[in-house]
Structures are given as structure tokens and as C-alpha cells.
Interface confidence: low
Amino acid sequence: HPIPDSSPLLQFGGQVRQRYLYTDDAQQTEAHLEIREDGTVGGAADQSPESLLQLKALKPGVIQILGVKTSRFLCQRPDGALYGSLHFDPEACSFRELLLEDGYNVYQSEAHGLPLHLPGNKSPHRDPAPRGPARFLPLPGLPPALPEPPGILAPQPPDVGSSDPLSMVGPSQGRSPSYAS
């Protein structure tokens, strides 16, 4: 399994991760949660600029989710509908992050308690949506590399999204189910 986002460092305010939120609970296809320029939220079958998200801890177990490309916060209406907002509303845009044992996470609106679900796509009724909250696998998203002065190797920053932030164990052998054969 991929290394989960279970590091104690992430339980405190201010910690930031760049992630793709991958789900295979989508009805028709695997998908990555995507916040688009027009404020709509959907699924991208493949990782895209709009699906690179910044997850920032607001307090223990509670995060905000920001679309890196669109600078829109993921927010949820009381009826469960998702949208991307240029303004952060703590009530609509704060999500409780619940870590599952298999490396997947479940996200719930802190205000309403509603689970985060991708908008349903057009799968026929015989490929039904799963019951219960959608599970998302946070896949690492690398921030854009800054140009380095010639001849200088910059050290890698610790990955606070990893249970091995200082890379003491070695490379993870986990891989996304997107690429399972």
C-alpha cells in the first residue's frame, strides 16, 4: 500500500501537502478530484494541473483544500454539492480528514458532517455508485521545481506528508491502483 498521510506532523495547524486526491469509487472510471477555473468540481481520469491540490492543516484533523492552478478552495454546500471558491469560508470549506488503515482517507465537511463525493458521472445504473462515503488516496504531487544556481545541489525538503519525513526508511514500494495491471 502507498504510505498513508498519517504523520503526526500533519495533525497540527500550518502543515501543507501537495496531493492529488485519487478515488476508485467513481461510478464510471477512476478519477482525481479537480477544481476548475469556473468553480466547478469534477473528476479527471488522469492527473491534470487542475487536480493538483494543496492540503493545509487548520487544526488537528481538519484541513482546507486549495486548487493549486485555480487558487480556488474546495467547499461544500449544505446539500452536499461541491464548488470551488476564491474566498475561504471556514464553515463551507473546512474538512475533517479521517485516515483509514489501507492508506485511503475519507473527508467530511466539518460544519455539515457530509462526506466528500465526486459529482456522479454517467455510469449506467448497472454500474452503481458505492454505498457510504467516498475514499480518496492522497497521491504525492511535486511542487514546481525552482531553478537552482549551477553547480549547487539543493537538499530535498522533508516530506511532511509521509510517515518517513526524513527518508530514513528508503523509497516506498507502494503504487497507485491507477497503474495496477
Partner: antibody
Framework: QVQLIQSGPGLVQPSQSLSITCTVS????????IHWVRQSPGKGLEWLGM???????DYNAAFMSRLSITKDNSKSQVFFKMNSLQADDTAIYYC???????????WGQGTLVTVSS | DVLMTQTPLSLPVSLGDQASISCRSS???????????LEWYLQKPGQSPKLLIY???NRFSGVPDRFSGSGSGTDFTLKISRVEAEDLGVYYC?????????FGGGTKVEIK
């Protein structure tokens, strides 16, 4: 990277059947649907049918009586079989992978099929 | 079946011009989930079609912003604000809301 590679005959005798295999890599058939589309000078682009990630199928009713789409997830292969071909079935046949909100993101290279004796 | 009718059949343009292609469906193409799966594809000679626009107006990743889609109900339009040489080819509309999915007959955009 994502690839769809088609293999199948270029020439089919009238009244015979056509079998094409679409072998995919870079993704799993358990996560995506695969469509079959053909293109002929006379009829343009025609959607023939698809197989969902679950293995369920949808067919164009115009071809349903002679078309079968199956797959083997473990081999990453999708199988297309059309029976009773006639001259007007001459076309380029494509397999293509869906996306989340759209249908044809990645395409096979196409198989030019000529129906002739 | 839903019939998709494209006009014009051929569209001669000068580079830098605006181009507009119309697509009309024989019935409303709203899926039972409320979305309209109207897509636009560009096919160049010897290539497979490439996705430009999905769900009426959403540009696919990497598609230049000179391409825009609009419409509702049964009438849809693809606009190219300033045609470039790489935009030449055959454009197809496609509906993926009702089985059998169907394509328009194509519009060939070519140099005047």
C-alpha cells in the same frame, strides 16, 4: 504512458467475421471503459459499442445482432468481434479509452479493414 | 437515435480569422444525471480525433483558450477566436448522453 495497441486482419472476406484485439498499457481495464468507433468515407465516424469497467456492455442497436465486445482484465486486452461483414463495413476501426466526463481521450492506432473477396 | 447535424460542411478561413461551427441535435441531449455530454473533436489527416471541448464548454487539458464551446438544449457552437495553421482539419461534434452515442458529419476547416 497510456497506450492502446490494436491487432487484427486488414482483409476480411464478405460474410466472414472480424476480430480485433485492443491491448492496453499504462492503466487498468478495471478502472476505465473502452469504446469501439469506426470511420468510413461514406458514413463518417460511427460509435459501435463499449465495455464498461465492470464488464457490462452497451451496443449501437444497428450492430447489436452481430457485435460482441469482451475483455480480459488480467491480460489488459479488449476483444472486438463483428460477424457477417459486407463491403460497406470497410472502414478504419478504433478502440478508445474514456475519461471521467468525456469519452475518447486515448485512441488505438486504428485498424484499416477492407471487406472484399 | 440522436441525429447530430453540423453546419457548414466546409469552412474556408484566413489565418487569424474567427471561425464558428454549429451543431444541432435532433433531441435534447441531457443525460439522466442532469449533465449534457456534448463534445468537440478535431481530426487531422492520418490521425485519430483529438478531444477539444467536453460538456458543452469545458476545454480539455492543454487545449488553447482560443477554442470555446457554448450552447444548450439542441443548439451548440464551437468558436475559434483566431485560427492558426495547426487548427486546420475536420471538426466533429459528438453526443455521449444517449446510447447509441452519435457524431456529427464533420466540418472541414481549410485555408481560403
Amino acid at each position: 504512458q497510456v497506450q492502446l495497441i490494436q491487432s487484427g486482419p486488414g482483409l476480411v472476406q464478405p460474410s466472414q467475421s472480424l476480430s480485433i484485439t485492443c491491448t492496453v498499457s499504462g492503466f487498468s481495464l478495471t478502472g476505465y471503459a473502452i469504446h469501439w468507433v469506426r470511420q468510413s468515407p461514406g458514413k463518417g465516424l460511427e460509435w459501435l459499442g463499449m465495455i464498461w469497467k465492470s464488464g457490462n456492455t452497451d451496443y449501437n442497436a444497428a450492430f447489436m445482432s452481430r457485435l460482441s465486445i469482451t475483455k480480459d482484465n488480467s491480460k489488459s486486452q479488449v476483444f472486438f468481434k463483428m460477424n457477417s461483414l459486407q463491403a460497406d463495413d470497410t472502414a478504419i476501426y478504433y478502440c478508445a479509452r474514456n475519461g471521467y466526463d468525456y469519452e475518447f481521450v486515448y485512441w488505438g492506432q486504428g485498424t484499416l479493414v477492407t471487406v472484399s473477396s | 437515435d440522436v441525429l447530430m447535424t453540423q453546419t457548414p460542411l466546409s469552412l474556408p478561413v484566413s489565418l487569424g480569422d474567427q471561425a464558428s461551427i454549429s451543431c444541432r441535435s435532433s433531441q435534447i441531449i441531457v443525460h439522466n444525471n442532469g449533465d449534457t455530454y456534448l463534445e468537440w473533436y478535431l481530426q487531422k489527416p492520418g490521425q485519430s480525433p483529438k478531444l477539444l471541448i467536453y460538456k458543452i464548454s469545458n476545454r480539455f487539458s492543454g487545449v488553447p483558450d482560443r477554442f470555446s464551446g457554448s450552447g444548450s438544449g439542441t443548439d451548440f457552437t464551437l468558436k475559434i477566436s483566431r485560427v492558426e495553421a495547426e487548427d486546420l482539419g475536420v471538426y466533429y461534434c459528438f453526443q455521449g448522453s444517449h446510447v447509441p452515442y452519435t457524431f456529427g458529419g464533420g466540418t472541414k476547416v481549410e485555408i481560403k
